[in-house]
């Protein structure tokens, strides 16, 4: 807390300018009017205030706006934003995408801080849903943003926003998140033709059900092994050897290198060895010839 002291004669700030960086902490507190600071916030970022001086400026704004800063001030916070606590930010009402962009720019190149996470949460809740422009902005600054949301939060993403998603934005998503995003992507890209559709839907396929994988296998898509390895195990297991061969195309040879890893390992265990042998890859572990395969799941469904 800065002590209240009278401003020395002739030092009262008439505007926010570079001369203030030579003021000591107590002089800044005594000689800079909070209302003047608020109206000239756009100048603060251009002035190299020290880490310690920024504390004083924040303190002045906190006194002026105890219920939270107005958006006109928030938009121009610049590096002062990094001095804010999540508690400070929860008092704000940020509605403008320009304000959000300005504050994200300050944190650019750094990991998502608790301040940024709180800011985004306030902004998205204020908008009611994660619209395309917002998602565009957030993933541009934080490629992993989508995957930081819970499946419940992702359910508020409209299918139209999926067009803003790039493959790298989904790198850290887990299957539960892809389960939510895949149907939205399928809806968003439904009017595209085969090859274009596959390029767009590919990064979402970790949430695809068996029937969609079967459909893709009929379209000569040549799925790469990296994508195949991210598919849901339960979606891959019912696929026949012929379907997997069609799905992977020339990439089918890569199965050999992955035969000990899921989902390939589990899929092999479900296939007849005879069928696996037709691939000519030397895959082992299938059901031996002459064995009867009982589909227990079907049996349970009937009983």
């Amino acid at each position: 807390e800065v002590e209240k002291t009278a401003c020395p004669s002739g030092k009262k700030a008439r505007e926010i300018d570079e001369s203030l960086i030579f003021y000591k902490k107590w002089e800044l507190e005594a000689c800079v009017d909070a209302a003047l600071l608020a109206t000239q916030m756009d100048r603060v970022n251009a002035i190299p205030f020290t880490y310690e001086q920024l504390d004083v400026l924040k303190h002045k704004l906190d006194e002026l706006y105890p219920q939270g800063y107005p958006e006109s001030v928030i938009q121009h916070l610049g590096y002062l934003f990094l001095k804010m606590s999540p508690e400070d930010i929860r008092k704000w009402n940020v509605t403008s995408l320009e304000t959000l962009k300005a504050l994200l720019e300050v944190n650019k190149g750094h990991e998502m801080s608790p301040q940024v996470a709180t800011l985004i949460d306030r902004f998205v809740k204020g908008r009611g849903q994660l619209d395309k422009d917002t998602l565009d902005t957030l993933t541009a600054f934080y490629p992993g943003y989508l995957c930081s949301l819970s499946p419940e939060e992702l359910s508020s993403v409209p299918p139209s926003s999926i067009w803003a998603v790039r493959p790298q934005d989904l790198d850290t998503c887990d299957p539960r998140q892809l389960d939510v995003l895949y149907p939205k992507a399928r809806l968003a890209f439904q009017n595209m033709n085969g090859s274009e559709y596959f390029v767009k839907i590919q990064s979402f396929l970790g949430g695809a059900p068996t029937e969609d994988l079967k459909a893709l296998s009929q379209q000569n898509v040549s799925m790469d092994l990296a994508t195949f390895m991210k598919l849901r195990t339960d979606a891959v297991l019912p696929l026949t050897v012929a379907e997997v061969q069609k799905l992977l195309g020339p990439h089918v040879e890569g199965l050999k290198a992955e035969e000990r890893h899921r989902p390939v390992r589990d899929w092999i265990l479900r296939q007849r060895q005879d069928d696996l042998d037709t691939l000519g890859l030397g895959l082992q572990g299938g059901i031996p010839n002459g064995y009867l395969v009982l589909d227990l799941s079907m049996q349970e469904a009937l009983s």
């Epitope: 030579f22 000591k24 020290t50 880490y51 310690e52 300050v106």
Partner: antibody, heavy 120, light 106 residues
Amino acid sequence: DVQLQESGPGLVKPSQSLSLTCSVTGDSITSGYYWNWIRQFPGNKLEWMGFIRFDGTNNYNPSLKNRISITRDTSKNQFFLKLNSVTTEDTATYYCAREGSYAPAWFAYWGQGTLVTVSA
Amino acid sequence: QIVLTQSPAIMSASPGEKVTMTCSASSSLSYMYWYQQKPGSSPRLLIYDTSNLASGVPVRFSGSGSGTSYSLTISRMEAEDAATYYCQQWSSYPPTFGGGTKLEIK
């Protein structure tokens, strides 16, 4: 990791200009930091000389009056010190250093330093 | 400008001994920074924001203080800690350094 390397002549004549270069690797001088020059006199006293900010703006120690200029070449990721009208009092080890925060506070990264002797 | 006065100017300690050095400021500060410098090397940041340890600094180093009085403590002196230690402020311009405390090993 961020690395800074000073270079320049080790001997300068009185009344001439001292010019030094700081080459930076591992970070861009246009990223959100402050790039400083600091010197250490023979008695070990340290003095901050000035900085060039990520946006190209400067600030200098008032004690150096109008003798100092810090500039940069973003294409080479280098920044420069020029000190005019040197005297023997300017004999020192000169360091370039990068700020450790988003606002001026502490010096997190230092070059290894270069000794400059001012002598006739 | 803010003047920083370090004391003592020179001190010595035995291995395992606790060492404390101080830095006094001519005006009240919120943060103090500490550096270690060994002969022939550049200063190395030890402590930032008064008490936070910089990356790679052993936990035997600690910083404390407020207002105009700050200190650096080494809980158990080791031979490699023999060096000169500087405090630094950047509360307002220009930033300034203390004159240093030279720590020798007994």
